[in-house]
Interface confidence: medium
């Protein structure tokens, strides 16, 4: 009985911890310069030139709003938004019917409270060159 009670207590503690972490993901503690605000919720970084580079991030805290400089590294996967970074599996085999191959990406890193898909699928055409490479590289790591 005591053992069951201990397990229940542990479970409750874990639940409290995960909900606290989830809440914290939405709000980044960053008191703006000279601000008395403790909890700032920051939007995604909007780069000045289309996809990446230096830009602005807008934040809110109660009735306050603020804009600060930010930088989106230019090597992030642009097609899925500069605020989401994915870890990709190896390319799958070439589908003879469609002439394409597929690989799946799992969300590795999200910037602040960015809206990111947990998994994404990428397709690309398989050229004769990549077909031959795929045979030679079978079982090897990244493309």
């Amino acid at each position: 009985m005591q053992h069951r009670g201990f397990l229940l207590l542990t479970l409750l503690a874990l639940l409290a911890l995960t909900s606290a972490v989830a809440k914290k993901k939405d709000k980044v503690k960053k008191g703006g310069p000279g601000s008395e605000c403790a909890e700032w919720a920051w939007g995604p970084c909007t780069p000045s030139s289309k996809d990446c580079g230096v830009g602005f991030r807008e934040g809110t805290c109660g009735a306050q709003t603020q804009r600060i400089r930010c930088r989106v590294p230019c090597n992030w996967k642009k097609e899925f938004g500069a605020d989401c970074k994915y870890k990709f599996e190896n390319w799958g085999a070439c589908d003879g019917g469609t002439g394409t191959k597929v690989r799946q990406g799992t969300l590795k890193k999200a910037r602040y409270n960015a809206q990111c898909q947990e998994t994404i699928r990428v397709t690309k055409p398989c050229t004769p060159k990549t077909k031959a490479k795929a045979k030679a590289k079978k079982g090897k790591g990244k493309d």
Partner: antibody
Framework: EVQLQQSGPELVKPGASVKIPCKAS????????MGWVKQSHGKSLEWIGD????????IYNQKFKGKATLTVDKSSSTAYMELRSLTSEDTAVYYC????????????WGQGTTLTVSS | SIVMTQTPNFLLVSAGDRVTITCKAS??????VSWYQQKPGQSPKLLIY???NLYTGVPDRFTGSGYGTDFTFTISTVQAEDLAVYFC?????????FGGGTKLEIK
């Protein structure tokens, strides 16, 4: 040619409100945010806030929250700043000036509207 | 707010002189600093952006430099038409803030 046209001088009584227009021409109005800047007599410049004409999104200098309200009318390419509960402290020249995320500096300014608050 | 401390407040120079104005930010603002010129009775005009880039149509006697917290604005050879107040401004973090201004007068 880019132009930001502001209205003429305003003389208003303490406690009243005033709405200052800034009509933009010579560029795509929605491509740039419109900022507002205050210059008290013989003093420096103070950024009041700015507005994104696309979605009406505003960011204010905390100092001017509750004092200034920024709006836009896309159909006439005009930005407005309303100042309320006016006091002698609000006597100043008010400028509108455009900026964008890709050009984050005030590259064009209106000629300024002189506001005098006096009974 | 980031405070931009501009020095000197006033400069009295002769035509042909070299003039230097400095601006110190209360925290790092990277190179996100602009310089403006305001002639009597006129609205401010952009001269320099990103600390050192000369804005279109601005004579090259105007230059800017600096990074982080310390910035310098220079007029290599002052001309009579340069009579104005000069302001620095940071657009690194809102609220955007301006220096107190430097009034330049010609002897």
């Amino acid at each position: 040619e880019v132009q930001l046209q502001q209205s003429g001088p305003e003389l208003v009584k303490p406690g009243a409100s005033v709405k200052i227009p800034c009509k933009a021409s010579g560029y795509t109005f929605t491509d740039y945010n419109m900022g507002w800047v205050k210059q008290s007599h013989g003093k420096s410049l103070e950024w009041i806030g700015d507005i994104n004409p696309n979605n009406g999104g505003t960011i204010y200098n905390q100092k001017f929250k509750g004092k200034a309200t920024l709006t836009v009318d896309k159909s006439s390419s005009t930005a407005y700043m309303e100042l309320r509960s006016l006091t002698s402290e609000d006597t100043a020249v008010y400028y509108c000036a455009r900026w964008s995320y890709s050009n984050p500096y005030f590259d064009y300014w209106g000629q300024g509207t002189t506001l005098t608050v006096s009974s | 707010s980031i405070v931009m401390t501009q020095t000197p407040n006033f400069l009295l120079v002769s035509a042909g002189d070299r003039v230097t104005i400095t601006c110190k930010a209360s925290q790092s603002v990277s190179n996100d600093v602009s310089w403006y010129q305001q002639k009597p009775g006129q609205s401010p005009k952009l001269l320099i952006y990103y600390a050192s880039n000369l804005y279109t149509g601005v004579p090259d006697r105007f230059t800017g430099s600096g990074y982080g917290t310390d910035f310098t604005f220079t007029i290599s050879t002052v001309q009579a038409e340069d009579l104005a107040v000069y302001f620095c401004q940071q657009d690194y973090s809102s609220p955007w803030t301006f220096g107190g201004g430097t009034k330049l007068e010609i002897k």
